[in-house]
């Protein structure tokens, strides 16, 4: 049984990135928390001309943005997963 | 290989117009901002602003805004900056300067135009 | 506007030697900044963006750090091919602004 559950074990991003992107260039972005499937926190980032990065969730300047969503968001109650376009 | 090839130098005279382009080849030109940048003789670099090929969408530094008009040309992959009311402040190099899309510097640089402004 | 400023605009270094130069932002730019080389005569050369990390084919003998505030560049071996005027860049917000330059001296 134990087999068979971790073969659903669904990670998206095979490779994370540190490189800061400044936010007039990121489109969306999607913070998946650990569960769903993936035993990692996993934040993945549209950029404005449709290309995807994953990106280190201990980035500073990621957990910036993530800061500043959640103050967004703070009205709303949470959710597990969440995609938020950057304004 | 990516490069940026700049028109030549002008002279003009105080009050004058000038057209300088940046004509682009061993990429996608249309995928890819252009920046220009300004370096004065006293060697410090200002960004004047950006364009987007793709839907022809300008980001101007406020200082510029009344100086330059950013466009480009899809068909021959060439963007354009004018630079209008010129005066002896205006002298300069200006480079035209891609901006790389996995880390937001700017990549490849054009070899610049020198611009001198004169009676 | 977002300032850059770097205190030295002359540095002056021996072949071998281990030079660091500094770079200082008005406000708070994370690790929004890039560093440039600019030779006599050329255009200027990215060398490092993202604060920290080295552009592809740049000798490993150029490192960088910083965030937020503070940035420092450093050459851990100068060779005689590093004479040449060094910028910050910051890319954290528009518009984009630079540092007013290190020109590097070979002794």
């Known amino acids: 049984v134990l087999e068979v559950y971790y073969t659903h074990l669904r990670c998206r991003c095979v490779q994370e990135s540190s490189v800061f992107i400044p936010r007039r260039f990121i489109d969306r972005i999607q913070i998946s928390p650990r569960g769903n499937g993936c035993p990692r926190k996993e934040i993945i980032v549209w950029k404005k001309n449709k290309s995807v990065v994953c990106v280190d969730p201990q980035a500073e300047w990621i957990q910036r943005i993530m800061e500043m969503l959640r103050k967004k968001s703070s009205s709303t109650p949470p959710v597990p997963v969440f995609k938020r376009k950057i304004p | 290989e990516v490069q940026l090839q700049q028109s030549g130098p002008e002279l003009v005279k105080p009050g004058a117009s000038v057209k300088i382009s940046c004509q682009a080849s061993?990429?996608?030109?249309?995928?890819?901002?252009m920046n220009w940048v300004k370096q004065s003789h006293g060697k410090r670099l200002e960004w004047i602003g950006d364009?987007?090929?793709?839907?022809?969408?300008?980001t101007y530094n406020q200082k510029f805004k009344d100086k330059a008009t950013l466009t480009v040309d899809k068909s021959s992959s060439t963007a354009y900056m004018d630079l209008r009311s010129l005066t002896s402040e205006d002298s300069a190099v200006y480079y035209c300067?891609?901006?790389?899309?996995?880390?937001?510097?700017?990549?490849?640089w054009g070899q610049g135009t020198s611009v001198t402004v004169s009676s | 506007d977002i300032v850059m400023t770097q205190s030295h605009k002359f540095m002056s270094t021996s072949v071998g030697d281990r030079v660091s130069i500094t770079c200082k932002a008005s406000?708070?730019?994370?690790?929004?900044v890039a560093w440039y080389q600019q030779k006599p005569g050329q255009s200027p050369k990215v060398l490092i963006y993202s604060a920290s990390h080295r552009h592809t084919g740049v000798p490993d003998r150029f490192t960088a750090s910083g965030s937020g505030t503070d940035f420092t560049f450093t050459i851990s071996s100068v060779q005689a091919e590093d004479l040449a005027v060094y910028y910050c860049?910051?890319?954290?917000?528009?518009?984009?602004?630079f540092g007013g330059g290190t020109k590097l001296e070979i002794k």
């Open positions: 364009i987007n090929p793709n839907n022809d969408g300008t």
């Open positions: 406000q708070d730019v994370s690790s929004g």
């Open positions: 860049q910051q890319y954290y917000n528009t518009p984009w602004t």
């Open positions: 300067a891609r901006l790389s899309w996995s880390f937001f510097a700017m990549d490849y």
């Open positions: 061993g990429y996608a030109f249309s995928d890819y901002y």
